[in-house]
Interface confidence: low
């Protein structure tokens, strides 16, 4: 039809002016389409190199709408993970410094000749909070014991206490229980508590990175030409006005957006779990009760101590023998104050209550994210028509669109008409990423039974048999010396989005 | 649907202790907060305080500690509302309400029970 | 104790007025997460508070959309752009920032 021929380019003109291009390359009247290569070849405004131009710029265009989806989910990831990061770090702060106001006066010298031993177990408490790789367990009974041995030493100056001595007093305290039931009460409350804290945080880091990695896979060239045809073939086809098909579009972004889809199903594991361990922030052996006083548990054991003094020396002279008199040391100490510090009345506050809230909510939101990425970058990014009629763009021409809407996921688009999918070879940063959410659900699941996976059948030496894989950089698989706690470096990167000084911060 | 169960009235004397319920059925008991509210005849709303149902974990406005105790039976989806010490000031109508397990609001109220202090 | 102040106490309206309900708190009450937990209910004669905004500006489910909050810090507002008969009742305002959390006075709107 020599009237089509003579068609004025003036609307592509001004499209593709509007992107940066030369003008220059813009045919004034549409020309014959042998040339294109993606477009369908009728009569076109589009000369080869405006085709690969609009190519390359479809094709950058998907991907900078896919980071920016990407880019909201982290960021709502990374302030829940700050959130619950510094509710979670307050409440340990705020319990050391109670002990270091209260104990002094409490305890007297039993305190302030020990601080050390105190401060030592907060921090160590603190890096296991934050992901290294140590025993909590271990920690703790190291913890009594040496505070054992130094308490003795300090009631019993009147005695020589040499280290073989003290070594019979280690061996005899399971059986004597120095310090009362606090020790077996902290650890079990401990445990669970912090494995809970630390396994939902590392979640949310876990989240956070699994989204930033997946948004830098790059779309292959078979999606470049779909999406191509899909946003700019009308325009060289002289059919500006018409927007793309809802289920054309939809099928192009299945295709293009195949193997993220596989991640939904671990994805929605993950983000379960995590809401199911909030279960375990509250009661007696939540989160906010035990973390927020340690320093109870402490005072209890000291008291403990203090009361059993007696029957404790007499039952250790039993065991390990009688000890050789100081003859330089003072009298036998004075029977102590009973430090009292009832446990803590924690006013209310209804922070975590609010954040679990908050997260609830937004993690649901986000649970169908990776298979609502093609429907929702059409409807927000694509213009698309507003109806499935014959009047909008199918990737042909102006008219219905008649294939069926593919299935989610690589599997299902083995009959994608719009992209050639090679179902065969799923992208190997995906499925690396679908083994992290894998790995950290097991965390979680672990957690949410009490059980700290790193150290489940953990030999002597410390190491662990889980995988580490929750801690995102090669700081958090260093192990941990437990005898070196007063020279170790915060291990701050274990939970992903925390800087190295903001660890230093509240150690 | 969701509801919240709760006995019209309760009648108590000066110094004794009721014990009220709110039976919740329509949904999953334990994934919702269960909160109190007080409204005496012609004033305003005053919170109580929560329950955990799922852990047991409650939590009170200081003014209530000593007055109220609030308990949960997972296993007939009950909440519980001791009142103690009872005085003509705790004459009022007692809300037990759902706390929206993703929205932190007050999303179903039970009809209220009537508590009359009288000797 | 954060102080929820309503005003006015009773509001007079005829059906299609549009109606104005302030509600100011003691303090701020934007909990520390960001958020604004100021909410709006409505209580009919005999029946149980039902809920009709949160966070200040959300209507709730099946809530009329001549029901509207506004406000930010310490003052709010709810507004209802033509009273029906349906609305007479006592609103009450009420915060779940800080614990414990407080309702206002409420104030009843009811027929000129």
């Known amino acids: 039809d020599p009237a089509s021929k003579s068609r004025s380019c003036g609307e592509v003109r001004q499209i593709y002016g509007a992107k940066g291009f030369s003008l220059s390359d813009v045919p004034q009247a549409e020309i014959s389409g042998e040339h294109l290569r993606i477009c369908p070849q009728g009569y076109t405004c589009c000369t080869s190199e405006m085709e690969e131009n609009l190519a390359n710029r479809s094709h950058a265009e998907l991907e900078t709408a896919l980071r920016d989806s990407s880019r909201v989910l982290q960021a709502m990831l990374a302030t829940q993970l700050r959130s619950f990061d510094d509710h979670f770090q307050h409440l340990l702060n705020d319990s050391e410094r109670t002990l270091q106001a209260t104990f002094p006066g409490a305890f007297g010298e039993l305190y302030t000749q020990n601080a050390r031993a105190f401060r030592d177990l907060y921090s160590e408490l603190r890096l296991y909070y934050r992901g290294a790789n140590l025993h909590l367990e271990e920690t703790l009974a190291e913890f009594w014991a040496r505070l054992l041995e130094r308490l003795f030493k300090q009631l019993h100056p009147q005695l020589l206490l040499p280290d073989d001595y003290l070594d019979c007093l280690g061996k005899q305290a399971e059986a004597l229980r120095p310090f009362g039931e606090a020790p077996r009460e902290l650890r079990l409350r401990a445990t669970r508590a912090f494995v809970a804290a630390r396994s939902f945080v590392q979640g949310l880091g876990v989240a956070s990175d699994v989204v930033r990695k997946v948004a830098q896979v790059p779309l292959g060239p078979e999606c470049s030409r779909a999406v191509m045809k899909l946003v700019y073939c009308a325009h060289c086809l002289g059919v500006p006005g018409a927007r793309p098909c809802p289920d054309y579009c939809r099928n192009v972004l299945k295709g293009c957006l195949a193997n993220q889809a596989d991640l939904d199903a671990e994805w929605r594991n993950l983000l379960d779990s995590m809401v199911l361990i909030t279960d375990k922030f509250w009661g007696t052996s939540g989160v906010e009760s035990v973390i927020g006083s340690v320093h109870t548990w402490l005072a209890e054991a000291i008291n403990a101590l203090q009361d059993n003094r007696d029957t404790l020396t007499a039952k250790v002279i039993q065991g390990c023998g009688n000890p050789k008199v100081n003859p330089q040391g003072p009298g036998p100490e004075e029977k102590r104050r009973r430090g009292k510090l009832a446990p803590r009345e924690r006013p209310p506050s209804g922070t975590l209550e609010k954040l679990v809230s908050e997260a609830k909510a937004q993690l649901r939101d986000v649970q169908d994210f990776w298979i609502s990425l093609p429907g929702t970058l059409c409807s927000e990014k694509m213009a698309l028509s507003t109806a499935s009629d014959d009047r909008c763009w199918n990737g042909m021409a102006r008219g219905r669109y008649l294939p069926e809407v593919m299935g989610d996921g690589l599997a299902n688009q083995i009959n994608n008409p719009e992209v050639e999918v090679d179902i065969t070879k799923p992208d190997m940063t995906i499925r690396q990423q679908i083994m992290q959410l894998k790995i950290m659900t097991n965390r979680l699941r672990s957690a949410y039974n009490g059980n700290d996976v790193d150290f489940q059948d953990a030999s002597d030496d410390g190491s662990g048999s889980g995988s580490g894989d929750g801690c995102l950089d090669d700081l958090c698989s260093r192990k941990v010396s437990r005898k070196s706690s007063s020279s170790r470096t915060p291990l701050t990167h274990a939970l992903p989005g925390l800087s190295e000084q903001e660890g230093q911060k509240t150690s | 649907q969701v509801q919240l169960q709760q006995p019209g009235a309760e009648l108590a004397k000066p110094g004794a202790s009721v014990k009220m319920s709110c039976k919740a059925s329509?949904?999953?008991?334990?994934?919702?907060?269960m909160h109190w509210v007080k409204q005496r005849p012609g004033q305003g709303l005053e919170w109580i305080g929560y329950i955990n149902p799922s852990s047991g974990y409650t939590e009170y406005n200081q003014k209530f500690k000593d007055k109220a105790t609030l308990t949960a039976d997972k296993s007939s989806s009950t909440a519980y509302m001791q009142l103690s010490s009872l005085t003509s000031e705790d004459s009022a109508v007692y809300y037990c309400?759902?706390?929206?397990?993703?929205?932190?609001?007050?999303?179903?109220w039970g009809q209220g029970t009537t508590l009359t202090v009288s000797s | 104790d954060v102080v929820m102040t309503q005003t006015p106490l009773s509001l007079p309206v005829s059906l299609g007025d549009q109606a104005s309900i302030s509600c100011r708190s003691s303090?701020?009450?934007?909990?520390?997460?960001?958020?604004?937990?100021l909410e709006w209910y409505l209580q009919k004669p005999g029946q149980s508070p039902k809920l009709l905004i949160y966070k200040v500006s959300n209507r709730f489910s099946g809530v009329p959309d001549r029901f509207s909050g506004s406000g930010s810090g310490t003052d709010f507002t709810l507004k209802i752009s033509r009273v029906e008969a349906e609305d007479l009742g006592v609103y009450y305002c009420?915060?779940?920032?800080?614990?414990?959390?407080?309702f206002g006075g409420g104030t009843k709107l009811e027929l000129k």
């Open positions: 009420f915060q779940g920032s800080h614990v414990p959390w407080t």
């Open positions: 303090q701020s009450i934007v909990h520390s997460n960001g958020n604004t937990y």
């Open positions: 329509g949904y999953t008991f334990t994934r919702y907060w």
């Open positions: 309400v759902r706390l929206g397990d993703y929205s932190y609001y007050f999303d179903y």
